[in-house]
């Protein structure tokens, strides 16, 4: 019996181990600079990197510029934007900005796209200050199906952040479904 | 059988529960505003609370300003932090300030530091109003190793509004690392 | 022995889902626009969604406005506010605005309210911009017992933007308290 | 690079009035900046004197020079100016501008350790 019960123990905790790993996706992306779009407009961001630096992902997927879910749960997804301007990049089209980030959900099966989350502030970046800077963080708690797409838009794309700790995303499962 | 079988679900219970309790370090420190220095463009902020009001901290250490990792995992890290003035401390040294949190990693083995999150917000607080007010929220998951180090740096320390439900900083761990 | 060690992984499989998902208690509670009070003094938010769009709850309860705790533990708390003004509104009583959050925790058995994270900005919202914007994001871990409630205050309720996307508040646990 | 250039010392009598200018160039602007007069008499300490805002205008004086001096500031010239009135022996000292970023509180600009840039100075003298 105690060689059935060492079984036992060991089995559960490899079980317990494994089924705990593979319960966690998470990511974290950050912004890829080298490909930002121009402009002032809202944007899809579409270009992340996943796996260098701070970027990292594991049991998630990431394509076409989205995060996909590949495990039905409750995630705690989050956003970090930073946006800035100095005077040696050239003049702003207007001194009135307003600076978004929407974090959305599209499912595919039925094709639509809805906001989850959206923080930003309209800014006078005035000619008086050389240099001009903001940050938007935006967090909360969603259920989410595999194969639903997380994605996120910004105003201003020209004026982000392209730093890893400035400008990124992400996502961990925090627990199953019932 | 049955014995055994008891012994093995109480045993596992206990394992079960105890190894939960281990996995899981979390900090939350609050700002210690009998020690703020003055001062500069980036300062590190090494006063701060970890036993008192909402401060706490479990299976981590707080030593000489920083949080000390003790256990490798995937944490949730985040900081929130509060900058203030009224006209009745005395007149700003500009109008136009620039409010920043950085959060920093410091590797002891291979001596180095790097910011894994930033943000805030260029600010005109002009004479025109007696209180300004601006508060700065980042947050993020990192893979953080045993002996790693976390710290605070902000601009404008002489600024920062000293309550512990404006200013603080704190991770708790979400998964181990495969 | 076999059968037995079927018995022990099948019951164990069952009381780890079961207690897994007992001990992880969550909300996400959206903005219920259709009763936000006016003025521009700082009051308790008491209608919000709980089962609608993206608001849910789980082993926790919302009544009376507040966010009622059924279960000890650590919980991650988080809130994310948005104001906004359109000059089609009308006029701003004052352009200097105090933009404010306030998650606050009130103890039953004690009767007393604490505020565990604050979180905004002074704002300068002057009439040369036609739409004016702004959101607050805080977080934080906490302790929190059976009965205690929680709660959001802020500033100019009149402000808020109603938008399921934009101004909510929720909290998941983490862990158990040693 | 910020360069300061210092100019109007020179000799008076007790009583008299002095107006000090310092040049600032380098920048296109300096709104985040705050200006600082100190003065060394000799075989004494570098002392403080006075600080303004560059954006505001506010200024922050030595007990000694309240109600005495004052500080201003032209932001289209970038010229800051220090006006000497009922000028003591005292007074007597080479005073230098100095520029450095803002932070904090006005007050905390007392220090020397505050400022990033230096003009050469130029002489006052008080004479009895």
């Known amino acids: 019996i105690r060689a059935e019960k060492a079984m036992v123990d060991g089995s559960w905790l490899d079980l317990a181990k494994r089924s705990k790993l593979e319960a966690q996706p998470f990511a974290h992306l950050t912004i890829n600079a080298t490909d930002i779009p121009s402009g002032s407009h809202k944007v899809s961001l579409s270009s992340w990197y996943h796996d260098r630096g701070w970027a990292k992902i594991s049991n998630m997927t990431f394509s076409n510029g989205k995060l996909i879910v590949n495990q039905d749960g409750f995630y705690y997804l989050y956003a970090n934007i930073c946006f800035r301007h100095h005077e040696t990049s050239g003049d702003l089209a207007t001194e009135y900005l307003q600076l978004m980030v929407y974090v959305t959900k599209t499912s595919i099966k039925i094709p639509s796209s809805h906001t989850l989350m959206k923080g930003g502030s309209t800014k006078y970046w005035s000619g008086n200050s050389e240099f001009h800077f903001y940050s938007i963080n935006v967090g909360g708690f969603f259920k989410l199906r595999s194969g639903e797409e997380i994605s996120i838009e910004v105003s201003n794309p020209s004026l982000l952040d392209p730093d890893q700790d400035a400008t990124y995303f992400g996502a961990f499962k925090v627990r199953d479904i019932d | 059988i049955r014995a055994e079988k008891a012994m093995v679900d109480g045993s596992w219970l206990d394992l079960a529960k105890r190894s939960k309790l281990e996995a899981q370090p979390f900090a939350h420190l609050t700002i210690n505003a009998t020690d703020i220095p003055s001062g500069s463009h980036k300062v590190s902020l090494s006063s701060w609370y970890h036993d008192r009001g909402w401060a706490k901290i479990s299976n981590m250490t707080f030593s000489n300003g920083k949080l000390i990792v003790n256990q490798d995992g995937f944490y949730y890290l985040y900081a929130n932090i509060c900058f203030r003035h009224h006209e009745t401390s005395g007149d700003l040294a500009t109008e136009y300030l620039q409010l920043m949190v950085y959060v920093t990693k410091t590797s002891i083995k291979i001596p180095s530091s790097h910011t894994l999150m930033k943000g805030g917000s260029t600010k005109y607080w002009s004479g025109n109003s007696e209180f300004h007010f601006y508060s700065i929220n980042v947050g993020g998951f990192f893979k953080l190793r045993s002996g790693e180090e976390i710290s605070i740096e902000v601009s404008n320390p002489s600024l920062l509004d000293p309550d512990q439900d404006a200013t603080y900083f704190g991770a708790f761990k979400v998964r181990d690392i495969d | 022995i076999r059968a037995e060690k079927a018995m022990v992984d099948g019951s164990w499989l069952d009381l780890a889902k079961r207690s897994k998902l007992e001990a992880q208690p969550f909300a996400h509670l959206t903005i219920n626009a259709t009763d936000i009070p006016s003025g521009s003094h700082k009051v308790s938010l008491s209608s919000w969604y709980h089962d609608r769009g993206w608001a849910k709850i789980s082993n926790m309860t919302f009544s009376n406005g507040k966010l009622i705790v059924n279960q000890d533990g650590f919980y991650y708390l988080y809130a994310n506010i948005c104001f906004r003004h359109h000059e089609t509104s009308g006029d701003l009583a004052t352009e200097y605005l105090q933009l404010m959050v306030y998650v606050t925790k009130t103890s039953i058995k004690i009767p007393s309210s604490h505020t565990l994270m604050k979180g905004g900005s002074t704002k300068y919202w002057s009439g040369n911009s036609e739409f004016h914007f702004y959101s607050i994001n805080v977080g934080g871990f906490f302790k929190l017992r059976s009965g205690e409630e929680i709660s959001i205050e802020v500033s100019n309720p009149s402000l808020l933007d109603p938008d399921q996307d934009a101004t909510y508040f929720g909290a998941f646990k983490v862990r158990d308290i040693d | 690079e910020v360069q300061l250039v210092e100019s109007g010392g020179g000799l008076v009598q007790v009583g008299d009035s002095l107006r000090l200018s310092c040049e600032a160039s380098?920048?296109?602007?300096?709104?985040?900046?705050?200006m600082g007069w100190f003065r060394q008499a000799p075989g004494k300490e570098r002392e403080f004197v006075a600080a303004i805002s560059w954006s505001s205008g506010n200024a922050y004086y030595i007990d000694s020079a309240k109600g005495r001096f004052a500080t201003s500031r032209d932001t289209a010239k970038n010229i800051m100016y220090l006006q000497m009135n009922s000028l003591k022996p005292e007074d007597t000292a080479v005073y230098s501008c100095?520029?450095?970023?803002?932070?904090?509180?006005?007050?905390?600009?007392?220090?020397?350790?505050?400022?990033?840039?230096w003009g050469q100075g130029t002489q006052v003298t008080v004479s009895s």
């Open positions: 100095a520029a450095g970023r803002g932070y904090g509180l006005l007050s905390e600009y007392t220090q020397a350790a505050r400022y990033d840039y």
């Open positions: 380098g920048r296109s602007r300096f709104s985040t900046y705050v």
